[in-house]
């Protein structure tokens, strides 16, 4: 899915209002220094691509994030604010239903969610490229100029 046409500000608002709190709950009891952030993103569509991948794609040692509250709210936000996103996710949803039902918080999952927090932080506050004296542009965000 191409996240270029999402309403980034609405997704950011959803994250700050609810998703971030669910991530904190998931990570409660974990020290911020425990994991090194190795996943990064360069612009807002890229950040959403990485966020989707880490949130919904099962990985070795962490197969259960898609059923977490933050994941469900992330999916809802993307479905609402990214045109056509829902249609692309039908197959993924079916695969999710076949996945294990039990929620197991492994150390690998905690590390993955720590990476997610870094990706969301980057998504929310991309540094703006400057053009001229007062015209700011972010290559990834042509339709949403006030993206802070």
């Amino acid at each position: 899915y191409d996240f270029t046409n999402c309403d980034f500000e609405k997704i950011k608002a959803a994250y700050l209002s609810t998703i971030s709190k669910d991530l904190i709950t998931y990570m409660s009891g974990t020290k911020s220094t425990e994991f090194n952030n190795t996943v990064s993103c360069s612009n807002r569509p890229h950040c959403l691509t990485e966020i989707q991948s880490l949130t919904f794609n099962p990985t070795a040692g962490c197969a259960s994030l898609a059923k977490e509250m933050f994941a469900m709210k992330t999916k809802a936000a993307l479905a609402i604010w990214c045109p056509g996103y829902s249609e692309t996710q039908i197959n993924a949803t079916q695969a999710m239903k076949k996945a294990r039902k039990s929620k197991v918080t492994t150390n690998k999952c905690l590390e993955q969610v720590s990476q997610l927090q870094g990706l969301w932080r980057r998504f929310n506050r991309p540094l703006l490229k400057q053009q001229g004296s007062s015209d700011y542009k972010d290559d990834d965000d042509k339709h949403h100029h006030h993206h802070h």
């Epitope: 990064s40 360069s42 870094g118 932080r121 506050r125 540094l127």
Partner: antibody, heavy 120, light 111 residues
Framework: EVQLVQSGAEVKKPGSSVKVSCKAS????????MHWVRQAPGQGLEWIGA????????SYNQKFKDRATLTVDKSTRTAYMELSSLRSEDTAVYYC?????????????WGQGTTVTVSS | EIVLTQSPATLSLSPGERATLSCRAS??????????MHWYQQKPGQAPRLLIY???NLGSGIPARFSGSGSGTDFTLTISSLEPEDFAVYYC?????????FGQGTKLEIK
């Protein structure tokens, strides 16, 4: 506990350059925007610019765009702010500040400040 | 750029009194229902300290006597009952539109 420790006070001649360092300890370094803010004696706070350590991307206040250079050294978890062509009006306390955990755009951790005096 | 105007420039009050500080933006700092306005306290010789983020949320470790309100262009920082340690300079800051800007500050002094 995240801490930002800045380099010591500097006295510089007009026309020269100064490079201030800001070393981060604790927490994650690479995924937090790092900002630089200055405060002239008896004056308010003025934003200079910001850098994202993950890839070195920068954003500058237009006022400082031609004279300020922000860099980072991820291996030592240190951010740098270099200001060139110094003039007396650049006499100020320079602060580094880390942006918050969520990307809300506030500064929750500040360095102790570095006093830069520009005098002939 | 967004200009933040704080008033009054100086506020003289006594401990125990209520303090109301204002910050007005030259254009809205709201985005998708959120107000990206933050408040800091600064004492002489110290770095600023975050008090309120996103208009009304209390920063970590900040006493409940501090509160923030407002949206759009008009914001208020209130200290319900002044303690001796509250006398300092207060700054508002917006992050909705680059460049990031601060207000010129309000000095809260003992009457």
């Amino acid at each position: 506990e995240v801490q930002l420790v800045q380099s010591g006070a500097e006295v510089k001649k007009p026309g020269s350059s100064v490079k201030v360092s800001c070393k981060a300890s604790g927490g994650t370094f690479s995924t937090y925007n790092m900002h630089w803010v200055r405060q002239a004696p008896g004056q308010g706070l003025e934003w200079i610019g910001a850098i994202y350590p993950g890839n070195g991307e920068t954003s500058y206040n237009q006022k400082f765009k031609d004279r300020a250079t922000l860099t980072v050294d991820k291996s030592t978890r240190t951010a740098y702010m270099e200001l060139s062509s110094l003039r007396s009006e650049d006499t100020a306390v320079y602060y580094c500040a880390r942006e918050d955990d969520y990307g809300e755009g506030y500064f929750d951790v500040w360095g102790q400040g570095t006093t830069v005096t520009v005098s002939s | 750029e967004i200009v933040l105007t704080q008033s009054p420039a100086t506020l003289s009050l006594s401990p125990g009194e209520r303090a109301t500080l204002s910050c007005r933006a030259s254009e809205s700092v709201d985005n998708s229902g959120l107000s990206f306005m933050h408040w800091y306290q600064q004492k002489p010789g110290q770095a600023p300290r975050l008090l309120i983020y996103r208009a009304s949320n209390l920063g970590s470790g900040i006493p409940a006597r501090f509160s923030g309100s407002g949206s759009g262009t008009d914001f208020t920082l209130t200290i319900s009952s002044l303690e001796p340690e509250d006398f300092a300079v207060y700054y508002c800051q917006q992050i909705n539109t680059d460049p990031l800007t601060f207000g010129q500050g309000t000095k809260l002094e003992i009457k």
